[in-house]
Amino acid sequence: MKVLQEPTCVSDYISLSTCEWKMGGPTNCSAELRLVYQLVFLISETNMCVPENNGAAGCVCHLFMEDMVGADNYTLDLWAGQQLLWKGSFKPSEHVKPKAPENLTVYTNVSETLLLTWSNPYPPDNYLYEKLTYAVNIWNENDPTDSRIYDVTYQEPTLRIAASTLKSGVSYRARVRAWAQSYNSTWSEWSPSTKWYNAYKEPFEKHHHHHHHHHHH
């Protein structure tokens, strides 16, 4: 039994790290392998993760970690029974993939503005709580080319956009993801999307003006 692609791990920097690797051939990951991990510190428990299959030869393990600090370093040992297949280490703060934002809501009743809000997925005592910035993806359900991304580079989990920037009488969807620049993280997964109908109508004067203008041509 041989490891083809060594484990690579990412951490949500709160409680979960996910490691993936590939074996040399078809493997029943949960029956044949164990990933043992331990925080390098005075008082720390040895933990064991039972991997799941990710394809015929791929394995994935969810490592539970608690109370992370920036300097944390974990030893990782991949075992097949009594045989040590691979030995490595993992520093969560250097491989951060934030949790996805939650509770995305779209408010359409704020005059001619769409207000999108979501919640920060971290509690206030977590380092990432004040470090996340966001990207919001809005797209037309019926036209995949009508899609845009708004960068939310401030920390408040809200976005305001003019309803007039979207097509009227069309159903739109939005989703949001997060990243932490200070930890050079990757982007989180997208949040679940939320749907709304853009009922915005152009003001009559503007509509009339456009119509008149068209008539003269």
Epitope: I43, V69, A71
Partner: antibody
Framework: EVQLVQSGAEVKKPGATVKISCKVS????????MHWVKQAPGKGLEWMGR????????IYASKFQGKATITADTSSNTAYMELSSLRSEDTAVYHC?????????WGQGTLVTVSS | DIVMTQTPLSLSVTPGQPASISCRSS???????????LEWYLQKPGQSPQLLIY???NRFSGVPDRFSGSGSGTDFTLKISRVEAEDVGVYYC?????????FGQGTKLEIK
């Protein structure tokens, strides 16, 4: 052997500032959160706040926001807490504690007396 | 803030007899990572507090097995199966799940 050695007792006048140190040996403070706990005379324990020495990230109980400032110097393996605008009710023993992820190691405490 | 309420506030026990201290939190102290960071500390006279129990039921290294922790949700208990003279002091429960972290008001144990 793990030791958290705090600076000595202080007597300060109202309105003054005091800075207490907590020198750690036996482990690297970057590997833990460093917390501070207040104990007024004859009273119970009160959590004040904490720091992650690696990135300097601090969080405080609202009661101590603006009163306490927690810092850490990883090169000397020392945590600090400064108390400002001292009043008589700040008279207490202050403990530094490392948490990973429970309070396993405590300093001996520093008595700060505020008296005119 | 989560309020931790201990009962009784004082306890007088004959050596060799059991003792029990209750701690109730004003709301759930399950952390977002699924753990319950409920701990028990003993502060002996003239000393700094020392850890007895972490994560509700786990005895810290070197703590005698006469100490045990139990509970879930918002109700937790520390039991001493047979009290010894060296157990005197003030016992505190503590929640480290939600900021601001909070201690109970303490229970003073004396020997009869």
């Amino acid at each position: 052997e793990v030791q958290l050695v705090q600076s000595g007792a202080e007597v300060k006048k109202p309105g003054a500032t005091v800075k207490i140190s907590c020198k750690v040996s036996g482990f690297n403070i970057k590997d833990t959160y460093m917390h501070w706990v207040k104990q007024a005379p004859g009273k119970g324990l009160e959590w004040m706040g904490r720091i992650d020495p690696t990135n300097g990230y601090t969080i405080y109980a609202s009661k101590f926001q603006g009163k306490a400032t927690i810092t850490a110097d990883t090169s000397s393996n020392t945590a600090y807490m400064e108390l400002s605008s001292l009043r008589s009710e700040d008279t207490a023993v202050y403990h530094c504690v490392s948490r990973r992820p429970w309070f396993a190691y405590w300093g001996q405490g520093t008595l700060v007396t505020v008296s005119s | 803030d989560i309020v931790m309420t201990q009962t009784p506030l004082s306890l007088s026990v004959t050596p060799g007899q059991p003792a029990s201290i209750s701690c109730r939190s004003s709301q759930s102290i399950v952390h977002s990572n699924g753990n319950t960071y409920l701990e028990w500390y003993l502060q002996k006279p003239g000393q700094s507090p020392q850890l007895l129990i972490y994560k509700v039921t786990n005895r810290f290294s070197g703590v005698p097995d006469r100490f045990s922790g139990s509970g879930s949700g918002t109700d937790f208990t520390l039991k001493i199966s047979r009290v010894e003279a060296e157990d005197v002091g003030v016992y505190y429960c503590f929640q480290g799940s939600h900021v601001p972290y909070t201690f109970g008001q303490g229970t003073k144990l004396e020997i009869k």
